[in-house]
Interface confidence: low
Amino acid sequence: EEELQVIQPDKSVLVAAGETATLRCTATSLIPVGPIQWFRGAGPGRELIYNQKEGHFPRVTTVSDLTKRNNMDFSIRIGNITPADAGTYYCVKFRKGSPDDVEFKSGAGTELSVRAKPSAPVVSGPAARATPQHTVSFTCESHGFSPRDITLKWFKNGNELSDFQTNVDPVGESVSYSIHSTAKVVLTREDVHSQVICEVAHVTLQGDPLRGTANLSETIRVPPTLEVTQQPVRAENQVNVTCQVRKFYPQRLQLTWLENGNVSRTETASTVTENKDGTYNWMSWLLVNVSAHRDDVKLTCQVEHDGQPAVSKSHDLKVSAHPKEQGSNTAAENTGSNERNIYHHHHHH
């Protein structure tokens, strides 16, 4: 009679994580008598998966009834597969011996590959805000997928980006893999409403990629432009001076009026108007009592935006003597100079 052969017909089996793997094994003969054992891996460090004779293997069930005398089907099912179960499984026939059974013949092995979905991509941007025309880096990470083949793409507002570097780790064989990608994105003034998207495609996703997003509103700082203008006289001896603060983001902004270099009022932008591009506008104004000044007044609008160094714009207010004031005595001039000379108002548009 021909010597017993152990046949594992499947060289490889591919199973999705969470499903059940069937590992097939048949023997060509009932002789010699002895049990079957299943191992993962070969050599001294191999891991016992199932022993027909003894032991408790809660995740393993046999396909056939191994207690029947004429059974030659030693296939098993392993439930709730995870990436950690990946490896090569060997069906090994033992010959009954004393005191221990002796290994007789092994099958060729079946490689179990586990398909595991990648985790939802997590996109993170720079720690500090940056201004338009700067390039910032975004990272995208996804973990726990198998097999290793994976595709990652970057988009900004639907437009595919090309300036990125991607690594899949580890380089060698592993039960599961991680992907890490860094993309460079050039900021523009219109990016307050922009999104950066990382898209991951994998065999387990069946054509429906996973996406991670980051809003550039958390990354961009658009510095304001300032314009100080003198409005027509509102009342006798009073001039209205406005400071227009335009196109800034985020909203955090503090404005200080300086009169000849001395702080006269500080206020925080509250009721702002939003532009279509997501940036903000704000306006502050002062009423200046020109009769209280003998000399020209330098009014400065100083703005500190989002904790950045202050920017400022100045306006020289020309003080010319009014006809009715001509010939006024020194005492009257002194009295005038003691009056509070700037009336502070702010107005939101």
Partner: antibody, heavy 123, light 107 residues
Framework: QIQLVQSGSELKKPGASVKVSCRAG????????MNWVRQAPGQGLEWMGF????????TYAQGFKGRFVFSLDTSVSTAYLQIGSLKAEDTAVYYC????????????????WGQGTLVTVSS | DIQMTQSPSSLSASVGDRVTITCRAS??????LAWYQQKPGKAPKSLIY???YRYIGVPSRFSGSGSGTDFTLTISSLQPEDFATYYC?????????FGQGTKLEIK
């Protein structure tokens, strides 16, 4: 279509100054930084620096601080390079080149170039 | 400053040849490397950025590779219009620096 159009050749005497213009077309000037690159006769390319066209902030390479000034006139979508106190060794072709982006610490690749302006300094 | 060294300085080749130009940086520049082509009397033309990416309109016979300190520009099959001087440029660190150029001539 994107193009950078530079002003014509200049012949100057030593000690004079020159202003080279670079007009941006097909895109918004203030969306991309502008670089200036020098190429002396028969020599390679030398980066002079760039200007952040959004803030107007210039950055000069070490050998180009002092006599060289980058400026903008956004109303006519034009960047300028002005060179003062010209010397014979300033004779070169000067190129403006648009940066793909303005980088904090990693510079930028240039995607579009002007046609170049030859500045000749001779007595 | 980061020094960029190209080799060879000049190279003779024939139409249809495969040509490789190398560029070595004096320190790690990651993939922040660009390649430019310049013909006599003309402005440089941008070919490659981020070491490997071709600009739109650049023929596929041009390819870039490398990272860190060693980079390569390969022209898979030389065409008559490819005879020119080629420059590499690093943009990892200020000041931006160029290689000295490689002149590609007709054999």
């Amino acid at each position: 279509q994107i193009q950078l159009v530079q002003s014509g050749s200049e012949l100057k005497k030593p000690g004079a100054s020159v202003k080279v213009s670079c007009r941006a077309g097909g895109y918004t000037l203030t969306d991309y930084a502008m670089n200036w690159v020098r190429q002396a006769p028969g020599q390679g390319l030398e980066w002079m620096g760039f200007i952040n066209t959004y803030t107007g902030e210039p950055t000069y390479a070490q050998g180009f601080k002092g006599r060289f000034v980058f400026s903008l006139d956004t109303s006519v979508s034009t960047a300028y390079l002005q060179i003062g106190s010209l010397k014979a060794e300033d004779t070169a072709v000067y190129y403006c080149a648009r940066t793909r982006g303005y980088y904090d610490f990693d510079g930028g690749a240039f995607d579009y170039w002007g046609q170049g302006t030859l500045v000749t300094v001779s007595s | 400053d980061i020094q960029m060294t190209q080799s060879p300085s000049s190279l003779s080749a024939s139409v249809g040849d495969r040509v490789t130009i190398t560029c070595r940086a004096s320190q790690n520049v990651g993939t922040h490397l660009a390649w430019y082509q310049q013909k006599p009397g003309k402005a440089p033309k941008s070919l490659i950025y981020s070491a490997i990416y071709r600009y739109i309109g650049v023929p596929s016979r041009f390819s870039g590779s490398g990272s860190g300190t060693d980079f390569t520009l390969t022209i898979s099959s030389l065409q008559p219009e490819d005879f020119a001087t080629y420059y590499c440029q690093q943009y990892n660190t200020y000041p931006l620096t160029f290689g000295q150029g490689t002149k590609l001539e007709i054999k």
